[in-house]
Interface confidence: low
């Protein structure tokens, strides 16, 4: 049995983490010569038959899951992987600290702690310079992010966000940056270990010229990679609740 039309890719430029009132472009990319694209916001009736959606100003109502597909002749492709568009700056920023401190010897241990005055049950940690966003919801269940056996790769600038599993696409503003310094080794900033590299798409003003307005309300963001966490009290093996979209 041969497969169907391959699924397109859907990306947010410059990132899928979008501060409120900032712009973002969603782009669906299929093979050359596609007859028709369909880009939709899941769990809603919003859709457009265009490959590109330019959002000049991000709103709460536009946060959520998006996906796209394309049509060639009478055939529809499989749907793209779903894109989670997150509105940031919805809540006040949390604080990020390092225990025992932000300077750590190579081979030592450090724990990054994200704290908020609100009753949020989800947290996301980002390392500046890494592609965004990366989530590993099954690895962490609390607002502490232990880094065991620190290496030079862990050096860099970190930020965290807090949010609620009830509204998983509405996040706080980012914390103030925390600079993690690894001593006793040559420092070569890189991605957090165990996370696969992925390309970072660059935003171009030319993108806007290709776009079509999707709605009057509309979505940029920080480029980085994240790890999400929920509090230690959570026993769910699924990690942070992912209120489906639909990926």
């Amino acid at each position: 049995q041969s497969g169907p039309l391959p699924k397109p890719s859907l990306q947010a430029l410059p990132s899928s983490l979008v501060p409120l009132e900032k712009p973002v472009t969603l782009r669906c990319q299929g093979p050359p010569g596609v007859d028709l694209y369909r880009l939709e916001k899941l769990s809603s009736s919003r859709y457009q038959d265009q490959a590109v959606l330019f959002i000049p100003a991000m709103k709460r109502s536009l946060a959520g899951r998006y996906r796209c597909s394309y049509q060639n002749g009478s055939l529809w492709s499989l749907p793209s992987d779903q894109l989670e568009l997150v509105a940031t700056g919805v809540f006040a920023k949390p604080s990020l600290s390092a225990q025992p401190g932000p300077a750590v010897s190579s081979g030592g241990d450090v724990t990054l702690q994200c704290q908020t005055r609100y009753g949020f049950d989800q947290f996301a940690l980002y390392k500046e310079g890494d592609p965004a966003p990366y989530k590993n919801p099954e690895r962490w269940y609390r607002a502490s992010f232990p880094i065991i056996t620190v290496t030079a790769a862990h050096s860099g600038t970190y930020r965290c966000y807090s949010f609620s599993s009830r509204d998983p696409y509405l996040w706080s503003a980012p914390s103030d940056p925390l600079e993690l310094v690894v001593t006793g080794t040559s420092v070569t900033p890189s991605r957090l270990p165990t996370e696969p590299p992925s390309p970072v798409a660059e935003f171009s003003e030319a993108t806007a010229e290709l776009t079509v307005s999707f709605t009057n309300e509309v979505f940029t963001t920080e480029t980085s990679r994240s790890i999400t966490a929920s509090p230690k009290e959570s026993d769910s093996p699924a990690g942070p609740a992912r209120q489906y979209y639909t990926k």
Epitope: L78, P79, E138, Y244, Y245
Partner: antibody, heavy 114, light 106 residues
Framework: QVQLQESGPGLVAPSQSLSITCTVS????????VNWVRQPPSRGLEWLGM???????DYQSTLKSRLSISKDNSKSQVFLKMNSLTTDDTARYYC????????WGQGTSVTVSS | DIQMTQSPSSLSASVGGRVTITCKAS??????IAWYQHKPGKGPSLLIH???TLQPGVPSRFSGSGSGRDYSFSISNLQPEDIATYYC????????FGGGTKLEIK
């Protein structure tokens, strides 16, 4: 050629945990998601959950509290773990590629019994 | 969660005949429905996705239609090898299978 192959324990005691591995070939887990589906004896298909290319997961709401799906991209393997098994979990378990599940494995039979 | 009500649960038809199976969703699924054929001892096979898009290699006597909450799947010129259980699947919001339809040949 796209292929998926499930491997499991066959027999599991009640209240114990179930672990099943889906080994795939012909496509990359970095880009494609994998679903888990089961079929109890003489009953229909039931979707359990999915792990996406980026590692994020979704679960059937009634099973979310005792289900965990993970993967190892480098080994082309996806893992299903289900806790607190009862005899109602006796079924044939399948893994299937992405949405809307265009390729399936042959399934592995799991019996929950003491 | 979205519920899918599939009917009938079983049906019998003659070779060369035509059968139709329906699935009703508990809410609008925006054409995100697929149909599968499942034979004993095998994994299910995808026949149709996105309501009416036929998988490559699937005979054109299989077809699908519908919109909103109501969808149907038909087999024309029924063949002996079509004996199987057929399932609908919605993939608009999480995934939910219909209860299945067991097809027998008279």
């Amino acid at each position: 050629q796209v292929q998926l192959q499930e491997s499991g324990p066959g027999l599991v005691a009640p209240s114990q945990s179930l672990s099943i591995t889906c080994t795939v070939s012909g496509f990359s887990l970095t880009y494609y998601g994998v679903n888990w589906v089961r079929q109890p004896p003489s009953r229909g298909l039931e979707w359990l959950g999915m792990i996406w290319g980026d590692g994020s997961t979704d679960y059937q709401s009634t099973l979310k509290s005792r289900l965990s799906i993970s993967k190892d991209n480098s080994k082309s393997q996806v893992f299903l773990k289900m806790n607190s098994l009862t005899t109602d979990d006796t079924a044939r378990y399948y893994c299937a590629r992405d949405l809307p599940m265009d390729y399936w494995g042959q399934g592995t039979s799991v019996t929950v019994s003491s | 969660d979205i519920q899918m009500t599939q009917s009938p649960s079983s049906l019998s038809a003659s070779v060369g005949g035509r059968v139709t199976i329906t699935c009703k969703a508990s809410q609008d699924i925006n054409k995100y429905i697929a149909w599968y054929q499942h034979k004993p001892g095998k994994g299910p096979s995808l026949l149709i996705h996105y309501t009416s898009t036929l998988q490559p290699g699937v005979p054109s006597r299989f077809s699908g239609s519908g919109s909103g909450r109501d969808y149907s799947f038909s087999i024309s010129n029924l063949q002996p090898e079509d004996i199987a259980t057929y399932y609908c699947l919605q993939y608009a919001l999480l995934l939910t299978f219909g209860g299945g339809t067991k097809l027998e040949i008279k």
